[in-house]
Amino acid sequence: WELTILHTNDVHSRLEQTSEDSSKCVNASRCMGGVARLFTKVQQIRRAEPNVLLLDAGDQYQGTIWFTVYKGAEVAHFMNALRYDAMALGNHEFDNGVEGLIEPLLKEAKFPILSANIKAKGPLASQISGLYLPYKVLPVGDEVVGIVGYTSKETPFLSNPGTNLVFEDEITALQPEVDKLKTLNVNKIIALGHSGFEMDKLIAQKVRGVDVVVGGHSNTFLYTGNPPSKEVPAGKYPFIVTSDDGRKVPVVQAYAFGKYLGYLKIEFDERGNVISSHGNPILLNSSIPEDPSIKADINKWRIKLDNYSTQELGKTIVYLDGSSQSCRFRECNMGNLICDAMINNNLRHTDEMFWNHVSMCILNGGGIRSPIDERNNGTITWENLAAVLPFGGTFDLVQLKGSTLKKAFEHSVHRYGQSTGEFLQVGGIHVVYDLSRKPGDRVVKLDVLCTKCRVPSYDPLKMDEVYKVILPNFLANGGDGFQMIKDELLRHDSGDQDINVVSTYISKMKVIYPAVEGRIKFSHHHHHH
């Protein structure tokens, strides 16, 4: 018996087609992805093959203005239209709190939404009962297939699930649910979830009875043969894990942003054992036409986005200096504003010993692309912020050793004075540079804001200590020459859309007046430009 698994993960509100790098589509003939194009390919496969499941491994939420405006209603609507068979909850599904998950998505989805390792308690338990499930048995042709869900147990640090959801260890929570499926005589079981490729592989190895793992969170691109676009494969598709009980378990993921449709064919014997598995992600490029009816629906929903982007979010009473003359040479108040917003967006009081789990932010000055003039009645709109942050990136959470941070700050000024983008803007950090010293030895003071303290204060950076830092995904991926971050990071979790983080902060504050306040200093007066 053959099953075709179509899968997406980490779509992050890319409902419309995008450019090759998943940013805004400019030249339509070279654009990719989007739900209209996805639907064309899915329908083509459904017509051609008998037993097809379309699965999503979480993080549909967060990533473009679509989510900012529609808050998840767009996810339910278009996933229903595409007839997704099941979805696992990702960490970003909790970005607007539990209510922001329940009302727009859990109550509106016509397909099962799954997670076995999230347990509700207190008053939430009855409110959320039945709206998501640990597993679902799906009828596929004359057979049944069990889908069991899982979600990153780091979600309380990455999103806003509140205090009434407990995130258990994935493997511990999955095993009893898989066992339950076995007692129901379900002998073909897919683990569908959102904990990253390393955990996907562990689940394949450790959870008895799981036949296939379909994952997300780590944006992992797997491919067998010559890859069709810019993404470099982390391994073959499917990635085969030998389980502790000796079975070969295929593990798949389909990069992110709806650029690819994962396509996996599994052959089962009559006892539900995997005989063979093969496939590859399908690049959703312009050779696949966009479905006209879904496209028309997208265009109808789009109207509200255009109206939103010109509405006032809040006001500034000071000039927001995002000029390259400032932000690539010295502390600029636009950099301070963005870093403050980044920290504010990551406030999570999960431990009494810590005022917050993260206090530090770094931001490449080259990523700040425009100032905002206060002499327009102080008005700040989404459109204004899109000029400041035009690349459609995310502000991510990483863990780094102090020694890596020191290298990053040395890199920040290693060729100072050439208006290059690697000059770092900061939050929760005080840095002093001496430009009279040779490159690689210019950081003379680096103090960081404590987290395990009731009164935050600045202490010298410790080389061997592990620190959490919020930074643009561009830096986490080694951009602007920050190879040491990419090479040495200990953990990396994708965060919220950059513009959304700043817009939420401005809306919350109502009136802003960021200052230049001595976060970045130069000794020997080498800062004159």
Epitope: R83, D85, K107, E108, A109, K110, F111, P112, S129, G130, L131, L133, K136, V137, L138, P139, V144, L184, N185, V186
Partner: nanobody
């Protein structure tokens, strides 16, 4: 809390009719596919009819085709099973079941929520 409650069962003569109701609470009916199952003494539970979440698709077991009609009233959060030309072999406990999914199925294991059942006895 999701609950399904069947009613309308009873004793009826062969050739007679009954209308079973399945009242749903704790969720909006329009997102759920509803199946009717029955279990006769000493036999396995079997699917008799089903209506998809959109209401656009209905299924019937061969043994009841032409005699049973399934319908839904989303406003009342209720699904009905109109049973005509009843036969003694229709005697069973009738259960309604729900699953959040688009498609009909007669497979017991795909349904997530079940009612307690209502007894239908066809006898002269």
């Amino acid at each position: 809390q999701v609950q399904l409650q069947e009613s309308g069962g009873g004793l009826v003569q062969p050739g007679g009719s009954l209308r079973l109701s399945c009242a749903v609470s704790g969720f909006a009916l329009d997102y759920y596919t509803i199946g009717w199952f029955r279990q006769a003494p000493g036999k396995e539970r079997e699917g008799v009819s089903c209506i998809s979440s959109s209401g656009g698709s209905t299924n019937y077991a061969d043994s009841v085709k032409g005699r049973l009609t399934i319908s839904r009233d989303n406003a009342k959060n209720t699904v009905y099973l109109q049973m005509n030309s009843l036969k003694p072999e229709d005697t069973a406990v009738y259960y309604c079941a729900a699953q959040r999914y688009y498609y009909c199925s007669d497979k017991v294991e795909v349904y997530d929520y079940w009612g307690q059942g209502t007894q239908v006895t066809v006898s002269s």
